[in-house]
C-alpha cells in the first residue's frame, strides 16, 4: 500500500482552522490477522529524508493522536485531550485520514506527517508516511481562508 | 501515571518454566495503538529484547528464544504474562516488562525482577 | 537480525564536559533509533526516540542526531547525575535489538 497527500501546501491565517488529509491507497488487506495504525506528528525537512523526526503537534505525541482499525474502517480520536489542545483526527471508508487543528497560531506553521502502520500477526510492521507543509500567516498579507496546493507527486515514500 | 509491574519467582530449577507477570496501572492493557514488551538483562550484560504483543493480541517474538517463548494477556486483570520454557542458566536476568507505542521505542518501563536460575 | 554497535564502550569525562556517544547499525534503520540512560539497578530511562527528538521531561542538554546507519547521542555539559551506562536500539524492524551499552564514568 502507499500514502498519498492530495496537498503538499496549506497556507492558512491565523486563527482558522485546517483540516490536513492523507489518503491510503493501493491494496488493503481486510483480514483478521491485519490491523491499520495511523497517526500524525511533526517533523522538520532533513536534507536526506522528511518525517524522520517525530515532534509532538501541541504537545501531543503520535500515540496521543492515533487511529487504529482493520482495512478501511471509519475512526476518529474522540479523546478529550486531543480535543482540549484543538485537534481531532478522523478516517473515512475510503481510506481517507486527516487531522483538524483549530485556531490556528504562527506557532503551527510547519512540517506535517501522517504515518501509517500495517500491524500483521508474526509480521514487521510495515510503515509509510506522507508529508505536508502547513504556513500560518497573519497581517494584510495572509489569505482570508486556508489555501490549498496540490502535491505534484501524491504518493510518498516507503520508509521501510 | 502509567506503571508497570513485573512478578513472580526469583528462583527456577534449570529445564523448568520461568513465569513471570506484569500488572499494569493507571492505564488499560487493552489500549490500542500499544505494545506490551519483554526484555531482559543478564547480570552485568547488556538489554535483549524477547518479545512484544500488541494490544489486539498479536505477538512478536526473539527468534534466538522463539521456541521457547509465550507472550500473554489477560485483560480482565490488566496483565501481561511472559512463559520462557526449558530455562537454563543462561536464562538468569532482570526481566522487565515494558510499553511501546506503535512504531516508537519502550517509553514506559517496569522497575524489573531478577530471576535465578539454579538447582 | 540487524546488529547494533556502539562505541565507545567505557568512557571517562568531568562535570561540564562534552560527550559524545556513537551507534552504527548493520543496516539502513531510517531514524528509527531510540537512546536510554541506565543507572545501577534501575530500569532504562527513555532520552531520545526518533534518532533526534526529546523524550518528555528529559533535559535539553541530552541531544541525537543521525540517519541511516550512523547515530550519535551528545551530552552537552555532563552533570553529576547523567554518570550512568547509555544505550542505543533500533525499532525500525524485528527483533528489535540494543548496542552492548556505553559506560560513562567520572574522571
Known amino acids: 500500500f502507499k500514502v498519498a497527500t492530495p496537498y503538499s501546501l496549506y497556507v492558512c491565517p491565523e486563527g482558522q482552522n485546517v483540516t490536513l488529509t492523507c489518503r491510503l491507497l493501493g491494496p488493503v488487506d481486510k483480514g483478521h490477522d491485519v490491523t491499520f495504525y495511523k497517526t500524525w506528528y511533526r517533523s522538520s525537512r532533513g536534507e536526506v529524508q522528511t518525517c524522520s523526526e517525530a515532534r509532538p503537534i501541541r504537545n501531543l505525541t503520535a500515540a496521543d493522536l492515533h487511529l487504529h482499525h482493520g482495512g478501511h474502517q471509519a475512526a476518529n480520536t474522540s479523546h478529550d485531550l486531543a480535543q482540549r489542545h484543538g485537534l481531532e483526527s478522523a478516517s473515512d471508508h475510503h481510506g481517507n485520514f486527516s487531522i483538524t487543528m483549530r485556531n490556528l497560531t504562527l506557532l503551527d506553521s510547519g512540517l506535517y506527517c501522517c504515518l501509517v502502520v500495517e500491524i500483521r500477526h508474526h509480521h514487521s510492521e510495515h510503515r509509510v508516511h506522507g508529508a505536508m507543509e502547513l504556513q500560518v500567516q497573519t497581517g494584510k498579507d495572509a489569505p482570508s481562508n486556508c489555501v490549498v496546493y496540490p502535491s505534484s507527486s501524491q504518493d510518498s515514500e516507503n520508509i521501510t | 501515571q502509567l506503571q508497570l509491574q513485573e512478578s513472580g519467582p526469583g528462583l527456577v530449577k534449570p529445564s523448568e518454566t520461568l513465569s513471570l507477570t506484569c500488572t499494569v496501572s493507571?492505564?488499560?492493557?487493552?489500549?490500542?495503538?500499544?505494545?506490551w514488551g519483554w526484555i531482559r538483562q543478564p547480570p552485568g550484560k547488556g538489554l535483549e529484547w524477547i518479545g512484544s504483543?500488541?494490544?489486539?493480541?498479536?505477538?512478536y517474538y526473539n527468534p534466538s528464544l522463539k521456541s521457547r517463548v509465550t507472550i500473554s494477556v489477560d485483560t480482565s486483570k490488566n496483565q501481561c504474562s511472559l512463559k520462557l520454557n526449558s530455562v537454563t542458566t543462561a536464562d538468569t536476568a532482570v526481566y522487565y516488562c515494558?510499553?511501546?507505542?506503535?512504531?516508537?521505542?519502550?517509553?514506559?518501563w517496569g522497575q524489573g525482577t531478577l530471576v535465578t536460575v539454579s538447582s | 537480525d540487524i546488529q547494533m554497535t556502539q562505541s565507545p564502550s567505557s568512557l571517562s569525562a568531568s562535570v561540564g564536559d562534552r560527550v559524545t556517544i556513537t551507534c552504527r547499525a548493520s543496516?539502513?534503520?531510517?531514524?528509527?533509533l531510540a537512546w536510554y540512560q541506565q543507572k545501577p539497578e534501575k530500569a532504562p530511562k527513555s532520552l531520545i526516540y526518533?534518532?533526534?527528538s526529546l523524550q518528555s521531561g528529559v533535559p535539553s542538554r541530552f541531544s541525537g542526531s543521525g540517519s541511516g546507519t550512523d547515530f550519535t547521542l551528545t551530552i552537552s555539559s555532563l552533570q553529576p547525575e547523567d554518570f550512568a551506562t547509555y544505550y542505543c536500539?533500533?525499532?525500525?524492524?524485528?527483533?528489535?535489538?540494543f548496542g552492548q551499552g556505553t559506560k560513562l564514568e567520572i574522571k
Open positions: 526518533a534518532a533526534s
Open positions: 493507571g492505564g488499560s492493557i487493552s489500549s490500542s495503538g500499544y505494545y
Open positions: 543496516q539502513g534503520i531510517s531514524s528509527w
Open positions: 515494558a510499553r511501546h507505542p506503535v512504531a516508537m521505542n519502550f517509553d514506559d
Open positions: 504483543l500488541y494490544s489486539s493480541g498479536y505477538t
Open positions: 536500539q533500533q525499532y525500525n524492524s524485528y527483533p528489535y535489538t
